[in-house]
Interface confidence: low
């Protein structure tokens, strides 16, 4: 598909990205001044819409229903972009770990979902650039690009009104938590194994960044919790009624076995007499110490054999370096503990302990936006973050405060979607823009 280069009068340009995650799809609208296309920090998010219902990977059995779910948000998007620009506004859909898992489980179903989406967007007035499943590595890199672009870490204007690479400005590492996967990306120090597929060289504005990025499939918040529930079930003498130390006291929930085990992430933990329709009841005991201990076992830390350059499950990771921004699910969990920005590990631990000690009836008083599905799981998520960051990524009491739990910069969400659009529309050229800008009169 060839996109003809249009000469537009000075004004605004728009771009649309659909982030098709495992648990939901979010539509982002971005805008920037047309005459400043390759400048840094000029793209901003003007609109965000959450598509009602679950993620597109849940439509494997009924792909024809996906477009109907998108309709409400797309109507709103049409109102956000001036109608005369609809035809020249690129729209991209990127699907992440939920679809990566569906593709592994049932490639035909995954393709049918994407085809249904493609035929829907071809009938829309925008310049549809495709619906694709992005890799975990791409998700990590685009998240890192977004965070650093929004923070202005790539270029700055010098005294001669030229864009230059900021001297001595550190980039920020990116920690992203989705529903089905989690990503870590950062510019590592000197000691690095350059032969690993997790190291990549990214060229932005003529500057080469050697980036470590890894995506852990099945370690997103929802899939990690399924692994946890499966582990509780494996270790329980009773198979239909068991306690969950991470659920609040006085809270009880029944799931079918299928809810826990009909995922590629837990298929290996299925009991011998597996029946997806059997019902299991988990009763919360709101037990902070036991929750912390049990959550550790969803990670295989032993596979690292005490090597420093290994996170868990035998995955190579250089020593963490510099500041980090933790966004998406990391931010929402910290926020539930009444924390944001940067804080000590001790503060995180005591907030986790306090939250996990609450009983169910107290949670609506603690959470401004109360939603049962999220509320019951924040204690698990907080302990999951502890083990992931401390025992996995090797953050310590000293380095933990370098993690900033943030949702957005300015009014733009920190999400891989912005980096994705910037790259696909070539808004961050690989070469350095050494064009002298006009000097404004004093």
């Amino acid at each position: 598909q060839i996109h003809k280069q249009e000469v537009l009068p000075p004004g605004l340009k728009y771009g649309i990205v659909l982030d098709a995650g495992s648990s939901r799809t979010t539509v982002y609208v971005y805008q920037w001044p047309a005459e400043k296309e390759n400048n840094t920090g000029v793209v901003s998010q003007t609109f965000k819409c959450s598509v009602k219902g679950s993620g597109i990977s849940s439509y494997g059995n009924n792909p024809q229903d996906v477009p109907r779910a998108f309709e409400e948000c797309m109507q709103k998007v049409k109102g956000q972009v001036p109608s005369h620009l609809h035809g020249s506004t690129p729209i991209h859909l990127g699907a992440t770990a939920g679809m990566r898992l569906l593709r592994l489980q049932n490639e035909t179903a995954a393709n049918e979902v994407l085809e249904s989406i493609q035929s829907y967007f071809k009938s829309q007035p925008f310049d549809f650039r495709g619906a694709q499943i992005i890799s975990g590595q791409e998700e990590g890199v685009y998240g890192w690009i977004t965070a650093n672009y929004l923070m202005g870490n790539f270029l700055e204007k010098n005294l001669w009104h030229m864009w230059v690479h900021p001297h001595g400005v550190e980039t920020t590492g990116a920690l992203d938590l989705g529903g089905a996967s989690t990503q870590i990306s950062f510019v590592a120090g000197e000691k690095m194994d350059l032969n690993t597929s997790d190291i990549m060289q990214v060229s932005l504005y003529g500057y080469v960044y050697t980036l470590y990025t890894h995506s852990f499939q099945c370690y997103g918040r929802n899939e990690a919790e399924k692994k946890f529930l499966a582990m509780l079930l494996q270790n329980s003498p009773t198979k239909n009624h068991l306690t969950n130390p991470c659920y609040p006291r006085d809270y009880s929930i029944s799931f079918t076995m299928g809810h826990v085990f009909d995922s590629l992430c837990t298929v290996d933990q299925r009991p011998e007499s597996y029946n997806p329709n059997d019902v299991i009841t988990f009763e919360g005991t709101g037990d902070p110490s036991l929750c912390k201990e049990k959550v550790a076992s969803i990670f295989d830390f032993k596979a690292c054999h005490d090597q420093e350059t290994c996170s868990f499950d035998g995955v190579y990771q250089p020593k963490i370096k510099g500041p980090f921004v933790a966004f998406a699910g990391f931010y929402y969990t910290a926020s539930a503990l009444n924390l944001s920005g940067s804080f000590s590990l001790d503060t995180f631990n005591s907030s986790t302990w306090n939250f996990c000690s609450q009983n169910w009836s107290q949670l609506p008083l603690l959470l401004p936006k109360f939603d049962e599905v999220y509320a019951r799981s924040y204690c698990f998520s907080a302990n999951y973050i502890y083990h992931l960051f401390v025992n996995g990524y090797k953050f310590t009491e000293e380095t933990w405060p370098q993690i900033h739990f943030e949702k957005e910069v300015g009014n733009s969400s920190i999400a891989w979607s912005l980096g994705y659009m910037l790259s696909l529309t070539n808004q961050i050229p690989a070469e350095s823009p050494l064009i002298r800008l006009p000097i404004e009169p004093p």
Partner: antibody, heavy 118, light 110 residues
Framework: QVQLVQSGAEVKKPGESLKISCKGS????????IGWVRQMPGKGLEWMGI????????RYSPSFQGQVTISADKSISTAYLQWSSLKASNTAMYYC???????????WGQGTMVTVSS | QSALTQPPSASGSPGQSVTISCTGT?????????VSWYQQHPGKAPKLILY???KRPSGVPDRFSGSKSGNTASLTISGLQAEDEADYYC??????????FGGGTKLTVL
């Protein structure tokens, strides 16, 4: 192999302070809780408290809260039990043990005998 | 928190079975499937023989088995052997995130 090695026997006078140690090896010391258990001469086992060396989070039995301090130095994979002022009633064998699951201690130290006598 | 209640002594002849009980409350034994049993020979450190009511660590013979009903857990040793003579302690996780031990049972092999 996985083991916990405790410091040697101690003979102390009432009012003195004491810190006994428990060094873990053969496993990820920061990933398991370490518990301390008292056994007075001819008596049963009493759970004193636990520590999570990964972040030094502690939990004490109400009977021992304020009487002892449990700490850890993860850089040397060692947990400690200390008293600021010993009494004759502190005479006992003290065991450290690794907690595997809820309250199940799968690996035990050899024990440290503490004798407090004037 | 009160210690769990165990009989002070139990006995049996070689080859026989013996059962030791451990009674607590709904806040410990009755509330959780987290009952453990330990064997302690004189002058030695305790050894874990059962955890989570019924599970045996590797190396523990299947002559040792556990069960639980209500607020009472039980340890059964079948095919009693001379080396089984020891003190046996139960323990349970509690609702206050602590652990409580039983008073101990001295097992004599006649």
């Amino acid at each position: 192999q996985v083991q916990l090695v405790q410091s040697g026997a101690e003979v102390k006078k009432p009012g003195e302070s004491l810190k006994i140690s428990c060094k873990g090896s053969g496993y990820s010391f920061t990933s398991y809780w370490i518990g301390w258990v008292r056994q007075m001469p001819g008596k049963g086992l009493e759970w004193m408290g636990i520590i999570y060396p990964g972040d030094s989070g502690t939990r004490y039995s109400p009977s021992f809260q304020g009487q002892v301090t449990i700490s850890a130095d993860k850089s040397i994979s060692t947990a400690y039990l200390q008293w600021s002022s010993l009494k004759a009633s502190n005479t006992a064998m003290y065991y450290c043990a690794r907690q595997q699951g809820a309250g199940a201690f799968d690996i035990w130290g050899q024990g440290t005998m503490v004798t407090v006598s004037s | 928190q009160s210690a769990l209640t165990q009989p002070p002594s139990a006995s049996g002849s070689p080859g026989q079975s013996v059962t030791i009980s451990c009674t607590g409350t709904s806040r410990d034994v009755g509330g959780y499937n987290y009952v453990s049993w330990y064997q302690q020979h004189p002058g030695k450190a305790p050894k874990l023989i059962l955890y989570e009511v019924t599970k045996r660590p590797s190396g523990v013979p299947d002559r040792f088995s556990g069960s639980k009903s209500g607020n009472t857990a039980s340890l059964t040793i079948s095919g009693l052997q001379a080396e089984d003579e020891a003190d046996y302690y139960c323990s349970s996780y509690t609702s206050s995130s602590t652990v409580v031990f039983g008073g101990g049972t001295k097992l004599t092999v006649l």
